[in-house]
Amino acid sequence: LPSPEGATSCECEEGFFRAPQDPASMPCTRPPSAPHYLTAVGMGAKVELRWTPPQDSGGREDIVYSVTCEQCWPESGECGPCEASVRYSEPPHGLTRTSVTVSDLEPHMNYTFTVEARNGVSGLVTSRSFRTASVSINQTEPPKVRLEGRSTTSLSVSWSIPPPQQSRVWKYEVTYRKKGDSNSYNVRRTEGFSVTLDDLAPDTTYLVQVQALTQEGQGAGSKVHEFQTLSPEGSGNLAV
């Protein structure tokens, strides 16, 4: 027989839930569907992930997103998590915004990003609502740097990158400083593959790094090299 009064709370149908913190008067809700649309746009050693909210919110407004990352080595095809080696623009779990930038990606590595949508009742089911996007990083190789010549007051430095990548580079940035002086440094920009650093101190070690500048931003930087000018007694013209 029907009760003379309505029930104070109703059991949820299968697939619908109330979170422990939900009041009994709240309607039953369910986990959201996956993020509707996910894009991964590579920019050098960065990827911008953007997505749109799930089409089905599950009847709740407390949707948050989590981003996870997997990297795969092209030579072997082996894959593994990459949380430890990448940097997110904000903590990748509990995101409320629908975009995040991932940086410090490695050249020539394949990455798969998973964006999961969750709400207050997602923890009550075992299934997950996620979408994935893959991207290959084609950041320029770090320049290979050589010391071509030196004098008491100058260092002649050259560098190379693989020919297929040269067309992507519009300039090279050469940063140098005296060894032991981390407070000041000098920067030279050039379109060529060599530079002579002048007005240096004799018999002094300089730290030199070359970085390619591309349309997408900075390419990978070279190693930091240590090059030493000649001492006055051992001087001759640009000799290595």
Epitope: S182, A220, Q228
Partner: antibody, heavy 130, light 108 residues
Framework: QVQLQQWGAGLLKPSETLSLTCAVY????????WSWIRQPPGKGLEWIGE??????????NYNPSLKSRVTISVDPSKNQFSLKLTSVTAADTAVYYC?????????????????????WGQGTMVTVAS | SYVLTQPPSVSVAPGQTARITCGGN??????VHWYQQKPGQAPVLVVY???DRPSGIPEQFSGSNSGNTATLTISRVEAGDEADYYC???????????FGGGTKLTVL
């Protein structure tokens, strides 16, 4: 082929001074920056510092965490370098190694600070206990 | 001061590939060296300058380095590869040498 042989006292009391010496056989002594490294039992490697003697100039560089207590000196006539660590405590108990870098420090203007170590001494276990 | 982070342990079955990572801020701009150390012995250099092998080291040891992570790869792992592995760099900002905390490789 360069060889390193090290020696020194293995048992010390707290507040005493640790003293170890490393002899270099073969190779050009003045071309390299010679290092001391230690490893407490069951723990990782810790760089102590390095020394170079070229011409009449001694160059020293020490781990900041030990700098106030450590001295690395050179005897170029014997191709030897030595480690002294003052005011030792139980925390200084470790195996101490001397080590040679892979390459001369500078060659034709190209220098290698913090180079890889291709040759190590046999290690000396130093215990500090009262 | 510059910090190098290694996983405390890595386990791998014989014949498989082991990867040991060494993380550090912009480590790709530094030369990374790797050592193998077996119990009671001094460390042995297995890879220098990111990926070069000293003479006598088998080609199953290889290395790579870019971004914030350097990796030592040991292919076709054997029981004899069970050891502690350490990475090392020079921090040019402070002019000091730094070791990673070490990774114990266990062959299952």
């Amino acid at each position: 082929q360069v060889q390193l042989q090290q020696w020194g006292a293995g048992l010390l009391k707290p507040s005493e001074t640790l003293s170890l010496t490393c002899a270099v056989y073969g190779g050009s002594f003045s071309d390299y920056y010679w290092s001391w490294i230690r490893q407490p039992p069951g723990k990782g490697l810790e760089w102590i510092g390095e020394v170079n003697h070229s011409g009449s100039i001694n160059y020293n560089n020490y781990n900041p965490s030990l700098k106030s207590r450590v001295t690395i000196s050179v005897d170029p006539s014997k191709n030897q370098f030595s480690l002294k660590l003052t005011s030792v405590t139980a925390a200084d108990t470790a195996v101490y190694y001397c080590a040679k870098p892979l390459r001369p420090h500078c060659t034709n203007g190209v220098c290698y600070s913090g180079d890889a170590f291709d040759i190590w001494g046999q290690g000396t276990m130093v215990t500090v206990a009262s | 001061s510059y910090v190098l982070t290694q996983p405390p342990s890595v386990s791998v079955a014989p014949g498989q590939t082991a990867r040991i990572t060494c993380g550090g801020n912009n480590i790709g701009s530094k030369n990374v060296h790797w050592y193998q150390q077996k119990p009671g012995q001094a460390p042995v250099l297995v890879v220098y300058d990111d990926s070069d092998r000293p003479s006598g080291i088998p080609e199953q040891f290889s290395g790579s380095n870019s971004g914030n992570t350097a990796t030592l790869t040991i292919s076709r792992v054997e029981a004899g590869d069970e050891a502690d592995y350490y990475c090392q760099v020079w921090d040019s900002s402070s002019d000091h040498l730094v070791f990673g905390g070490g990774t114990k490789l266990t062959v299952l």
